[in-house]
């Protein structure tokens, strides 16, 4: 004997987040009389998605005009799909009863999978700056994607990195997933202009991966090298002492001149020159009046860079010798003058 069958022809349906899902259902008979209902999940905890007979379901529309007496198409459309809508949907025929309709037959179910794009990867570096030759860790996070399969790659200046660890959570089934990856990068003195890139590829991105970047300029600290030199000037009783501060990054730098251990002058790097690799050079000088000194003077250039402990370089100024015969005649890279006469 013929009996109504509830046919859900699609075992699974895959829909992109934000789109509309069509869940197909056919009843093969108008008998018995009674409504169709759609549920997500099975058993006592199932969630009512649509009731042909009554209720308000703003996201659901019927594909056919279900008011037609002969209608056997009970397919529905669910709008604005989100990952939370994933699950197995059942089309269930009820037999008209009193006082309540009685469940008569269920379809085999259609599994709705939601394709959700990963969020833009966010790359974060260490909280404190590090110096060249040190290894620093970068993290990359992206959330809200589905299905779970995802590919993450790290690059430094276009070169793929291999030292990283990646986790996708949760491990089990979920409506959406997150990825977390930590990469280790060894800094070099040339990394001020370098970039670390986290690249995420997912089926929803149609071959156009998402990228998150971090500039190593926010991570690296390149300590300066100091050179103190003495040069004669035209006036025979004067000597120009320069402190060359080279190849430092970031720019935050304070220089102090000490005469025999006593603070002579403190200044902050302002008019710096930038090197091709992104580091900076700066020069400070003192104009020393030698005739005012009976004894040799120990001049010290002390630099505090980016809040780090000070580094210094000293130069002994011999007052007995003729100024023109002392020191070296090194060309300055920066002529932004800072002068001080010592009398």
């Amino acid at each position: 004997e013929e009996e109504l069958q509830v046919i859900q022809p699609d075992k699974s349906v895959l829909v992109a987040a934000g789109e509309t899902a069509t869940l197909r259902c056919t009843a093969t008979s108008l008998i018995p009389v009674g409504p169709i209902q759609w549920f997500r999940g099975a058993g006592p905890g199932r969630e009512l998605i649509y009731n042909q007979k009554e209720g308000h379901f703003p996201r659901v529309t019927t594909v056919s005009e279900s008011t037609k007496r002969k209608n056997m198409d009970f397919s529905i459309r669910i709008g604005n799909i989100t990952p939370a809508d994933a699950g197995t949907y059942y089309c269930v025929k009820f037999r008209k009863g009193s006082p309540d309709d009685v469940e008569f037959k269920s379809g085999a179910g259609t599994e709705l999978s939601v394709r959700a794009k990963p969020s833009a990867p966010v790359v974060s570096g260490p909280a404190a700056r590090a110096t060249p030759q040190h290894t620093v860790s970068f993290t990359c996070e992206s959330h809200g994607f589905s299905p779970r399969d995802i590919t993450l790659k790290w690059f430094k200046n276009g070169n793929e990195l291999s030292d990283f660890q990646t986790n996708v959570d949760p491990v089990g089934e979920s409506v959406s997933y997150s990825i977390h990856s930590t990469a280790k990068v060894v800094l070099t003195r040339e990394d001020v202009h370098s970039q670390v890139i986290c690249e995420v590829a997912h089926v929803t991105l149609q071959g156009d991966p998402l990228r998150g970047t971090a500039n190593l300029s926010e991570t690296i600290r390149v300590p300066p090298t100091l050179e103190v030199t003495q040069q004669p000037v035209r006036a025979e009783n004067q000597v120009n002492v320069t402190c060359q501060v080279r190849k430092f990054y970031p720019q935050r730098l304070q220089l102090t001149w000490l005469e025999n251990g006593n603070v002579s002058r403190t200044e902050t790097a302002s008019t710096v020159t930038e090197n091709k690799d992104g580091t900076y050079n700066w020069m400070s000088w003192l104009l020393v009046n030698v005739s005012a000194h009976r004894d040799d003077v120990k001049l010290t250039c002390q630099v505090e860079h980016d809040g780090q402990p000070a580094v210094s370089k000293s130069h002994d100024l011999k007052v007995s010798a003729h100024p023109k015969e002392q020191g070296s005649n090194t060309a300055a890279e920066n002529t932004g003058s800072n002068e001080r006469n010592i009398y």
């Epitope: 004997e1 056919t26 008979s29 108008l30 008998i31 056919s64 008011t67 056997m72 198409d73 397919s75």
Partner: antibody, heavy 119, light 107 residues
Amino acid sequence: QVQLQESGPGLVKPSQTLSLTCTVSGGSISSGGDYWAWIRQHPGKGLEWIGYIYPSGFTYYNPSLKSRVTISVDTSKNQFSLKLSSVTAADTAVYYCAREGYHSGMDVWGQGTTVTVSS
Amino acid sequence: DIQMTQSPSSLSASVGDRVTITCQASQDISNYLNWYQQKPGKAPKLLIYDASNLATGVPSRFSGSGSGTDFTFTISSLQPEDIATYYCQQFAYLPWTFGGGTKVEIK
């Protein structure tokens, strides 16, 4: 009022695919919630329901023909079509298109087109 | 599939006679039954829907009754233009199925 007109070749070779189109005039194929059906009648015999389509694309085919039948709709042309593959002499018949109207009956029919399967 | 058994397969009656055709379904189809008239060389025409409702423009001499498995189609006063073959069709269960037809002739 709504009228239907079948069109397509009257002669099809065995093993080939029979293709017929039904053009709807006097109304829109996608309004009113009607189903659009194909029925055939073998020479001197009764009527056999082939299947129907709803403008949304929902179809149901007679299981006796299901593996060989495709019914499709083109709402922009106000047409629906029948394709029957791997035909044999047993598929020689008059093919009708019809509207399954509000009252569940097939209330509008085309005049029918005779299709002969022969080499 | 639901089997629709129509009887008689043919009949001959005089103009003005009352003609009755029966249709039996292989199982309960409620009142989901239609009756069609097909004249030679023409497409079928819907006469009765939902077992007993007259389709638009159909003369009142045609009528239908029945529910469940047994249905009757009646022409209260046969007219010459009623010479045709009559078919019942169920739409309770997919696929829709037709009866074998009853050919009505004038004596």
